[in-house]
C-alpha cells in the first residue's frame, strides 16, 4: 500500500436545505482506471462511513440506493454533494481515495472538511 496526498477544503457551510458540496482532489502518481472514494464522518472521536463509490471512466459517481451522496469526477477531482443534513450532522467529513487499478494500490486520506449545518428557523405563525 502506497500513500497519496488528498486535498479538501477545511470548512463548508451547508445550505438552508441541508446540502453541502465540496471538492476532494487527489495527487495521482499514475493513470488510475478504477478509483474508490469514501466519505467518512468523524464526530466525538468516532468514525462512521457516510457513503462510498467506485468509478471508472465516466464522470458520474454511482452510490448505493440509500446513499445521501451524489458526485461527479473530472480528472483527479471528485465533486461530492451530501444531502439531507441537519444540525446534528455537523462534523468533520473526511475524503478517502483508493486507486484500485492498476497496481500498485494507493491510499490517500484527506484532513477532513468541517461541515456546519444550521437547521432553518421555523416560519412564524401567520395571521392569514
Amino acid at each position: 500500500c502506497k500513500a497519496m496526498h488528498v486535498a479538501q477544503p477545511a470548512v463548508v457551510l451547508a445550505s438552508s436545505r441541508g446540502i453541502a458540496s465540496f471538492v476532494c482532489e487527489y495527487a495521482s502518481p499514475g493513470k488510475a482506471t478504477e478509483v474508490r472514494v469514501t466519505v467518512l464522518r468523524q464526530a466525538d472521536s468516532q468514525v462512521t462511513e457516510v457513503c462510498a463509490a467506485t468509478y471508472m471512466m465516466g464522470n458520474e459517481l454511482t452510490f448505493l440506493d440509500d446513499s445521501i451522496c451524489t458526485g461527479t469526477s473530472s480528472g483527479n477531482q471528485v465533486n461530492l454533494t451530501i444531502q439531507g443534513l441537519r444540525a446534528m450532522d455537523t462534523g468533520l467529513y473526511i475524503c478517502k481515495v483508493e486507486l484500485m487499478y492498476p497496481p500498485p494500490y494507493y491510499l490517500g486520506i484527506g484532513n477532513g472538511t468541517q461541515i456546519y449545518v444550521i437547521d432553518p428557523e421555523p416560519c412564524p405563525d401567520s395571521d392569514f
Partner: antibody, heavy 115, light 106 residues
Framework: QVQLVQSGAEVKKPGASVKVSCKAS?????SYWINWVKQAPGQGLEW???????????YYNEMFTGRVTMTRDTSTSTAYMELSSLRSEDTAVYYC????????WDQGTMVTVSS | DIQLTQSPSFLSASVGDRVTITCSAS?????IHWYQQKPGKAPKLLIY???TLASGVPPRFSGSGSGPEFSLTISSLQPEDFATYYC?????????FGGGTKLEIK
C-alpha cells in the same frame, strides 16, 4: 474497433445454471465496466449488475443477488455472467454492455428455460 | 430503487413530425441517458449525461432536463427513427431503465 462478442444461445431446464461469456476487443478491457442487462421477450431492459474488470469489483441488482455471479478473465479480456436456479421467467436475451455509458453492446445471448 | 416513468408508452407520429418523450424519476437524479432499440437488435446509446449526443447520432436528436424531469426530442422524424426509446439513470444502484416508449408510424 470496439467489439463485444457473446457466447451462443442456450436452452436450460428449470433449476439449472447458465454461464454466458462476453469477449471484449479493440479497447483496454480493464478501463471500463462490463454491465449485464436482461430483456425478457416483449419486455423492457433490466440491469443485472456490473463488474470492474481490473479489480473484479462487482455491483449486483438485488433482484438477482444470490443467483447471479459476475467474473472476468483479464488474460482473455472476457467477462462472464452465471445465473443459477433458473426458472421460466429467466427466459430472455442477456446483453453485455461496456462502461458507464453502455456505449457498446453485443447482439445478446438468448437463454431459454423450459422443461 | 429509483423508478423512471416514461410517457407516453406508445406514440404514433408521421415522418417530419417533432416529438418529445419524457422521463420522470421518482427521486432527483444527476443525469439521464437515452437509448434507441429496434426489433431484434441491441439497444444503441443515443444521448448521455442528459444532453450530450453519442458519436454518430444525428443532431435532430436532443435531450434536456434536470432533477426528476427529463426529455428527449426528435426535431423532424425520419423513417429510421421509428423504434423503442429507453431512458436510464446511474446516480444510484441499482441502475434502472424507464419502461420504454414505442414510436410507431401513424
Amino acid at each position: 474497433q470496439v467489439q463485444l462478442v457473446q457466447s451462443g444461445a442456450e436452452v436450460k431446464k428449470p433449476g439449472a445454471s447458465v454461464k454466458v461469456s462476453c469477449k471484449a476487443s479493440g479497447y483496454t478491457f480493464t478501463s471500463y465496466w462490463i454491465n449485464w442487462v436482461k430483456q425478457a421477450p416483449g419486455q423492457g431492459l433490466e440491469w443485472m449488475g456490473r463488474i470492474a474488470p481490473g479489480s473484479g469489483t462487482t455491483y449486483y441488482n438485488e433482484m438477482f443477488t444470490g443467483r447471479v455471479t459476475m467474473t472476468r478473465d483479464t488474460s482473455t479480456s472476457t467477462a462472464y455472467m452465471e445465473l443459477s436456479s433458473l426458472r421460466s421467467e429467466d427466459t430472455a436475451v442477456y446483453y453485455c454492455a461496456r462502461g458507464d455509458y453502455f456505449d457498446y453492446w453485443d447482439q445478446g445471448t438468448m437463454v431459454t428455460v423450459s422443461s | 430503487d429509483i423508478q423512471l416513468t416514461q410517457s407516453p408508452s406508445f406514440l404514433s407520429a408521421s415522418v417530419g413530425d417533432r416529438v418529445t418523450i419524457t422521463c420522470s424519476a421518482s427521486k432527483s437524479v444527476s443525469y439521464i441517458h437515452w437509448y434507441q432499440q429496434k426489433p431484434g437488435k441491441a439497444p444503441k446509446l443515443l444521448i448521455y449525461d442528459t444532453s450530450t449526443l453519442a458519436s454518430g447520432v444525428p443532431p435532430r436528436f436532443s435531450g434536456s432536463g434536470s432533477g426528476p424531469e427529463f426529455s428527449l426530442t426528435i426535431s423532424s422524424l425520419q423513417p429510421e427513427d421509428f423504434a423503442t426509446y429507453y431512458c436510464q439513470q446511474r446516480t444510484t444502484y441499482p441502475l434502472t431503465f424507464g419502461g420504454g416508449t414505442k414510436l410507431e408510424i401513424k
